[in-house]
């Protein structure tokens, strides 16, 4: 299953398959989900360690068992692979890093204002894969405002180092966000030239595609199908790149297919994974287990459930067959591909789905009334779980917030249906930025079913939480994905980084706003809370948060909306945005309907019809 | 230049059987899958089988599951479809076609063979 | 199997216009989806492939777009000789099933 807990100072013993620099733990554990042998990864900061040649130092491992012996080291960081962590599996990176200037191929050079500005040209420069900025106080007044777009052969810095004034940071094109745009289009019978990064064996175009996009120097391939004159180079996908970018010639060839990256594309980038079966091929590998199960279905499933394998072959030979049962044959290789790809054969064959991040349907746990005021904008993707709830009835408008929990499950308040409990006139907007986007040819989600708490009443402040489910479940992509929730009764975690988003008003008296508004708000313990609200009763089962100056806050428009914290890399709905004094006054923090204190009544109300919970459980 | 050529079309009461043979040209046969599509008169395109370029892989829509029977012949360089306990239903054009696996489409198809079962 | 949705079933336009045929499934299938052609009297014929991609030979005025559960079919500026039926095709698993058909009749 999915595991996210980190160890602090620790550090894995053996079962080393690679090793490179990365900037944090997060992003060493991202290199480690998407290598297709790592399973356990070790990061070491650069307080950690004295060798300067192993500061920032991340070890990507593989264990048979899945596990592997930890030894004590201080500040090293240690965990998990996200394979089979669903909706949490994603290439995208959006950190900046302060004070550390990441190493590699400076290729270009531009003077800029910010770091953002930095990035943005990183993201739309097709060889760039991070950056450094020099900022305006850099002790060299000739590098001041120098923005440094960088590349290596394997996609992460060659070395990094500690230096003031530097800010460092990776493309933003595994998230969807490059200004470049993509060549969708296929070229059959077609061969392009330059110089091959890689070489791997995929039984069609679309797998060779997919494999170009998610390599970290792939800009175009050429695949040669089963039926190329050479038996040799039969299924051969070639990844490629070239210093322009692009082919620098392309020859016509019988039976060669040839294609773009996908990487530059705009909103959408495909899945990490290969979910197609295909018929009458067998895929050669290392065997990792046999299994007789019924039907290929199935054996996909027991590939992707076992962590380590990668691809499968489910024979119908009558001699690996008894009654409705046949052998399925687990298998792995070095780069995740086959080793050999044979056709016309009694078997089908596919890959574990292990890298999907679609995941089940679900609403994602762990184990362990009222446009935000004082925020800014928030750009595509930051906070994909949040909807906008909207109420057509003569016109249409924009009422409440939500977050999105599951393929078909939004959390919101309950006091947003005050009054207007008919599911048929809502209408619910996902990944979205700007209200003004939405045209009448936007797609929606319409509600199937409004659960709103058995104990909230109207105009009372307490249980103000409910649940939508959605006719239809929803695809998730970079910019549509849930929030994970808390683990029931968390009051052990202290959250130091948390944050309220919406479209509310800008302040008590305004409007709704355009673009998704942000704002960092420190948490309050209920003490302090309930001192500020002396009239109402503030329970456990509501969280707090606000300045004690205010001048920023959730405000009519957020409710209902998320406020969410980031610990150990990873988001949590912490509190649903519920009710408060005005907006943003002084010493009246806005208070939020606590999660975790609900966890019992959301895992009952989204237990599927079969009687199982809709959980998944990245810890 | 593909050739794909259907004969063996005709008419045929219910309940009796009749053979389809697709013979090519213009490629090597061996090393492709091939499909057998058929058309209703006046209505849309319905995916009957599909095999695999050994005969060793093959595949049916559930409404001709357990009456027909896909199979081919790389030495001659021919496809067929045995139809068996044919119904009024099975009335089309029956088209064969190559199936390019590595972009997953029909990319070559043949005229087609009618098939009219009637008493 | 996977069952495909193809909308409308019927357009009438004028040479010079633009149409747009949609294909829905209910599963997600990635952009393994095709567009044949079929004109009167003769089997049908791939225009395009992987949801985007033109076969060879086929007039550039013929695009596809989407992935995963929507798609379409644009022709930018309709000729006379593209009256034909449209289907769609999803060759993500087998059977290997097709939309119902657009029948494209021209003004």
């Known amino acids: 299953g999915c595991l996210t807990q980190l160890y602090e100072n620790a550090f894995f013993r053996g079962g080393d398959v690679a090793s490179m620099y990365t900037p944090n733990a997060q992003y060493c554990q991202m290199r480690c989900t998407f290598h297709p042998r790592c399973l356990l990864f070790s990061f070491l900061p650069a307080s950690s360690i004295n060798d300067m040649e192993k500061r920032f130092g991340c070890f990507l491992k593989d264990s048979v068992t899945g596990t592997l012996p930890k030894v004590h080291r201080t500040g090293a960081v240690s965990g998990h692979s996200l394979k089979q962590c669903g909706h949490q599996i994603s290439a995208c990176h959006r950190d900046i890093y302060k004070g550390v200037d990441m190493r590699g191929v400076n290729f270009n050079v531009s003077k800029v204002s910010s770091v953002e500005e930095c990035q943005k040209r990183c993201t739309s420069n097709i060889r760039c894969q991070f950056f450094s900025y020099a900022t305006q106080t850099f002790h060299k007044a000739e590098y001041r405002n120098n923005c440094l777009l960088k590349y290596s052969p394997g996609g992460t810095p060659t070395a990094i180092k500690v230096l003031s004034n530097v800010e460092s940071g990776f493309s933003l094109k595994p998230c969807a966000l490059s200004e470049i745009g993509c060549h969708m289009n296929i070229f059959q019978h077609l061969a392009f030239s330059d110089v091959d990064v890689a070489r791997v064996l995929t039984p069609d175009a679309f797998v060779c595609r997919t494999i170009c996009t998610y390599h970290p120097n792939c800009l175009f391939f050429t695949f040669y199908t089963n039926v190329w004159k050479i038996e040799s180079q039969r299924n051969v996908c070639l990844l490629k790149t070239s210093e322009s970018g692009t082919p620098s010639s392309s020859t016509p060839q019988e039976n060669t297919i040839s294609g773009y990256s996908l990487l530059t594309c705009k909103r959408t980038l495909p899945e990490p994974c290969h979910s197609k079966i295909y018929p009458g091929v067998d895929f050669g590998g290392e065997e990792l287990n046999v299994t007789f199960v019924k039907g290929v279905n199935v054996c996909q499933e027991t590939c992707t459930k076992m962590i380590r394998c990668q691809f499968f072959t489910y024979s119908l030979l009558p001699e690996d067959c008894k009654e409705e049962k046949c052998k399925c044959f687990l298998r792995l290789s070095m780069d995740g591909s086959p080793t050999r790809i044979a056709y016309g054969t009694q078997g089908s064959s596919g890959y574990s789905l292990r890298l999907c991040n679609t995941g089940d349907n679900s609403v994602c746990t762990t184990k362990t009334s009222t446009r935000i005021v004082g925020g800014t904008n928030s750009s595509w993707g930051e906070w994909p779980w949040q909807v906008s709830l909207q109420v057509k009835l003569t016109a249409q408008r924009h009422l409440c917030g939500g977050s999105l929990i599951g393929h078909q499950w939004v959390l919101t308040a309950a006091h947003c249906f005050d009054g207007l409990p008919l599911q048929d006139v809502w209408r619910i907007y996902s990944g979205i930025l700007n209200l003004s986007d939405i045209t009448k040819d936007t797609p929606f989600s319409q509600i199937k079913e409004i659960i709103i708490h058995q104990n909230y009443k109207v105009s009372e402040g307490n249980h103000d939480i409910a649940l939508i489910k959605l006719q239809a479940p929803l695809n998730y992509t970079e910019f549509q994905k849930p929030i994970c929730l808390p683990s029931k009764g968390d009051t052990s975690t202290i959250y130091t980084n948390c944050w309220v988003t919406g479209w509310g008003f800008s302040k008590e008296k305004g409007e709704i706003q355009n673009i998704l508004q942000k704002v960092n708000i420190p948490l309050v313990t209920n003490e302090e809370c309930q001192k500020r609200y002396q009239d109402y009763k503030i329970t456990q089962r509501m969280v707090c948060a606000g300045y004690k100056e205010g001048g920023k806050d959730a405000c009519k428009g957020d409710s209902g909306g998320p406020l969410v914290c980031k610990h150990n890399g990873m988001w949590r709905l912490v509190g649903i945005t519920s009710w408060g004094e005005g907006c943003a006054r002084r010493e009246q923090p806005g208070v939020y309907t606590k999660v975790a204190e609900y966890m019992d009544w959301i895992l009952e109300k989204t237990q599927s019809s079969d009687g199982k919970a809709q959980m998944q459980s990245p810890a | 230049e593909v050739q794909l050529l259907e004969s063996g079309g005709g008419l045929v009461q219910p309940g009796g059987s009749l053979r389809l043979s697709c013979a090519a040209s213009?490629?090597?046969?061996?090393?492709?899958?091939m499909a057998w599509v058929r058309q209703a008169p006046g209505k849309g395109l319905e995916w009957v089988s599909y095999?695999?370029?050994?005969?060793?892989?093959?595949s049916y829509a559930d409404s001709v599951k357990g009456r027909f029977t896909i199979s081919r012949d790389n030495s001659k360089n021919t496809l067929y479809l045995q139809m068996n306990s044919l119904r009024a239903e099975d009335t089309a054009v029956y088209y064969c076609?190559?199936?390019?696996?590595?972009?997953?489409?029909?990319?070559?198809w043949g005229q087609g063979t009618l098939v009219t079962v009637s008493s | 199997d996977i069952q495909m949705t193809q909308s409308p079933s019927s357009v009438s336009a004028s040479v010079g216009d633009r149409i747009t045929i949609t294909c829905r499934t209910r599963q997600s299938i990635s952009n393994y989806l095709n567009w044949y052609q079929q004109k009167p009297g003769e089997p049908p014929k791939l225009l395009i492939f992987?949801?985007?991609s033109l076969q060879s030979g086929v007039p550039s005025r013929f695009s596809g777009s989407g992935t995963g559960t929507e798609f379409t079919l644009t022709i930018s500026s309709l000729q006379p000789e593209d009256l034909a039926i449209y289907y769609c095709q999803q060759s993500y698993d087998i059977p290997f099933t097709f939309g119902q058909g657009t029948k494209l009749e021209i003004k």
């Open positions: 076609t190559t199936w390019a696996g590595w972009i997953a489409a029909a990319d070559y």
């Open positions: 213009g490629f090597t046969f061996s090393e492709y899958d």
């Open positions: 095999i695999v370029s050994s005969g060793g892989f093959t």
């Open positions: 992987a949801a985007s």
